[in-house]
């Protein structure tokens, strides 16, 4: 058993049929010794007597909260939530797998650029008896600070018959240089408790790994007297890291109809401009991505051809 | 410790072009490590992030663009002296931080390349034969580092009377080479800067 | 599947036109660029022009500006290279080719042969 | 026009061993640059798109890299189909223009 937080406790439980659970010894936070009574949430059923209660936890009927009370009065509260470990590992029932990029990934961050800004986000089908904390740090071992906000719901879904809620969380890295060269990876720690359940997600990533610019801006075309080319030239997103000659992107110029199955033009270039060939009913696309360390493109910027 | 603006001329800046294959020869070198030894630890989430110029050189403080020096995090107190003349520098106006910035690149290229050259003796002899350091990145370093063009003492090659360890010179290589590459990466900024200043 | 079928190789005079074509099987013709390149003997290869079937643009090689005409007909799924005021240095395979990505070629036909001698 | 210079023009390698070889653009072409084989009597055949992409069917012996103005085909360890004239082709812009192309032979 550990604290979560003041009067919030995790019980860690081997989840199998018949497992012994846990004897967890609850101490009334108090300076009175006798008279003391103990309940369970809004049951008024008397589960003991005394300064301490040893109950044994065993399954999620046991864990909820406790309290202590003398002559009617409530003296302390001890929340008590369940962490499971089935066949050795920890339970991720309350998160979604988003199997990007690979399987078992429940949190991805992202960010715009080097300022030691980024953006975490993960799904859940729940919708109730929710709640989330997010810490993150660089390294572990001693580790620098990073400053993650509130996670708030970012998104809801209709998959199918279900509704999939996003949640997201910002972080900045207290003293991030934006020219530094990564060693020490950073760390994102999730706690997640659905009702009584507690679950934990880790992230680590270095920040140049999850680099993904806004889309190029300002896209512009320019016809070609006595040619169907086109001139499209754009500027780098606003969320760029500067100055753009140490942080220089990369860009793919495609024409493509509304059909990803229809024929294109497809350009990559270092400038901020390039010529293509237009047609009818198609759209100029520009992404833009880091052009010396290859993580992720941008999503597209578009204008149509006409 | 800084790059100012007044650099050399657009097109007058040979290094560009080396560095530009230095980082395409890295990044290839690192893939085929990648591939061969899929066995071994070798991804970056595996490897430990070990920089064998830490303490050594300065690359990023020397090199940091003006733009940057503003913000404290970037401004770190080591200290290291340079030799200065190389041919990059191909303006007289050239200051005496940029000449820092490219001597510390050229330290850094020296140091890794006797590092690479000691571990691909070991390599060699490895009856597995399972992987060699490709020539053309040696070869791309050497280069970039004659157009750098710094007088330097020469590092002597370390030699090692013990029977090498293919296993840990293996997961040393995927180490190597993943801190070489980011360096790379920084170096190729660095010179795009200057080119573009 | 998708297939190019040239025409048979051909013989010409300096000074007269060659028009060659190109059936094409296997997806939707006008979903497709064709290209067409050449080949002198033991040489390298040369691009001439594309041509849009979907809606007739072309592009050709400056170098052959004014010199080709390439077509396409829809109905056939065939499309046609024409080289006008040939020169014996004109003598090459002429290869069509196709691909759904404008600037580079993925299906090649087998080629055909045009000689131009007096 | 962007010039392509594939080097060497004759590359003769021993069944096993491997090859590279390399093409230069007279000016930048970002990735834009396409691989080709071509075997005698043969129209040509796509191996490699925008540098470095492979293309399915392509055996992956065959890779390549490179950007800006210096790329590379290489051909991990030849195999004696792998005997061919290999191009290759810019598209960054019109018109498209092909190297002179290099003649894999057997040493």
């Known amino acids: 058993i550990w604290e979560l937080k003041k009067d919030v406790y995790v019980v860690e439980l081997d989840w199998y049929p018949d497992a012994p659970g846990e004897m967890v010894v609850l101490t009334c936070d108090t300076p009175e010794e006798d008279g003391i009574t103990w309940t369970l949430d809004q049951s008024s059923e008397v589960l003991g007597s005394g300064k301490t209660l040893t109950i044994q936890v065993k399954e999620f009927g046991d864990a909820g909260q406790y309290t202590c009370h003398k002559g009617g009065e409530v003296l302390s509260h001890s929340l008590l939530l369940l962490h499971k470990k089935e066949d050795g590992i920890w339970s991720t029932d309350i998160l979604k797998d988003q199997k990007e990029p690979k399987n078992k990934t429940f949190l991805r961050c992202e960010a715009k650029n080097y300022s030691g800004r980024f953006t975490c986000w993960w799904l859940t089908t729940i919708s109730t008896d929710l709640t989330f904390s997010v810490k993150s740090s660089r390294g572990s071992s001693d580790p620098q600070g990073v400053t993650c906000g509130a996670a708030t719901l970012s998104a809801e879904r209709v998959r199918g018959d279900n509704k999939e809620y996003e949640y997201s969380v910002e972080c900045q890295e207290d003293s991030a240089c934006p020219a530094a060269e990564e060693s020490l990876p950073i760390e994102v720690m999730v706690d997640a408790v659905h009702k009584l359940k507690y679950e934990n997600y880790t992230s680590s990533f270095f920040i140049r790994d999850i680099i993904k610019p806004d889309p190029p801006k300002n896209l512009q075309l320019k016809p070609l007297k006595n040619s169907r080319q086109v001139e499209v030239s754009w500027e780098y997103p606003d969320t760029w890291s500067t100055p753009h000659s140490y942080f220089s992107l990369t860009f793919c110029v495609q024409v493509q109809g509304k059909s990803k199955r229809e024929k294109k033009d497809r350009v990559f270039t270092d400038k901020t401009s390039a010529t293509v060939i237009c047609r009818k009913n198609a759209s100029i696309s520009v992404r833009a991505q880091d052009r010396y360390y290859s993580s992720s493109w941008s999503e597209w910027a578009s204008v149509p051809c006409s | 410790r800084n790059l100012p603006v007044a650099t050399p001329d657009p097109g007058m800046f040979p290094c560009l072009h080396h560095s530009q294959n230095l980082l395409r020869a890295v990044s290839n070198m690192l893939q085929k490590a990648r591939q061969t030894l899929e066995f071994y630890p070798c991804t970056s989430e595996e490897i430990d992030h070990e920089d064998i110029t830490k303490d050594k050189t300065s690359t990023v403080e020397a090199c940091l663009p003006l733009e940057l020096t503003k913000n404290e995090s970037c401004l770190n107190s080591r200290e290291t002296s340079f030799i200065t003349n190389g041919s990059c520098l191909a303006s007289r106006k050239t200051s005496f931080m940029m000449a820092l910035c490219l001597s510390s690149i050229y330290e850094d290229l020296k140091m890794y390349q006797v590092e690479f050259k000691t571990m691909n003796a070991k390599l060699l002899m490895d009856p597995k034969r399972q992987i060699f350091l490709d020539q053309n990145m040696l070869a791309v370093i050497d280069e970039l580092m004659q157009a750098l063009n710094f007088n330097s003492e020469t590092v002597p090659q370390k030699s090692s009377l013990e029977e090498p360890d293919f296993y840990k010179t293996k997961i040393k290589l995927c180490i190597l080479l993943h801190a070489f590459r980011i360096r790379a990466v920084t170096i190729d900024r660095v010179m795009s800067y200057l080119n573009a200043s | 599947q998708v297939q190019l079928v040239q025409s048979g190789a051909e013989v010409k005079k300096p000074g007269s036109s060659v028009k060659v074509s190109c059936k094409a099987s296997?997806?939707?013709?006008?979903?497709?660029?064709l290209h067409w390149s050449r080949q002198a003997p033991g040489q390298g290869l040369e691009w001439m022009g594309w041509?849009?079937?979907?809606?007739?643009?072309?592009e050709y090689a400056p170098k052959f500006q004014g010199r080709v005409t390439i077509t396409a007909d829809e109905s056939t799924s065939t499309a046609y290279m024409e080289l006008s005021s040939l020169r014996s240095e004109d003598t090459a395979v002429y290869y069509c080719?196709?691909?759904?990505?404008?600037?580079?070629?993925?299906?090649w036909g087998q080629g055909t042969l045009v000689t131009v001698s007096s | 026009d962007i010039v392509m210079t594939q080097s060497p023009l004759s590359l003769p390698v021993t069944p096993g061993e491997p090859a590279s070889i390399s093409c230069r653009a007279s000016q930048s072409i970002s990735i834009n640059l396409h691989w080709y084989q071509q075997k005698p009597g043969q129209a040509p055949r796509q191996l490699i798109a925008?540098?470095?992409q492979s293309i399915s069917g392509v055996p992956s012996r065959f890779s390549g890299s490179g950007s800006g103005t210096d790329f590379t085909l290489t051909i991990s360890s030849l195999q004696p189909e792998d005997f061919a004239t290999y191009y290759c082709?810019?598209?960054?812009?019109?018109?498209?223009?092909f190297g002179q192309g290099t003649k894999v032979e057997i040493k």
């Open positions: 925008f540098a470095s």
């Open positions: 296997g997806g939707t013709f006008s979903d497709y660029y």
């Open positions: 080719a196709r691909n759904k990505e404008l600037r580079y070629i993925d299906v």
């Open positions: 041509i849009d079937p979907e809606n007739g643009d072309t």
């Open positions: 082709q810019q598209s960054n812009s019109f018109p498209l223009t």
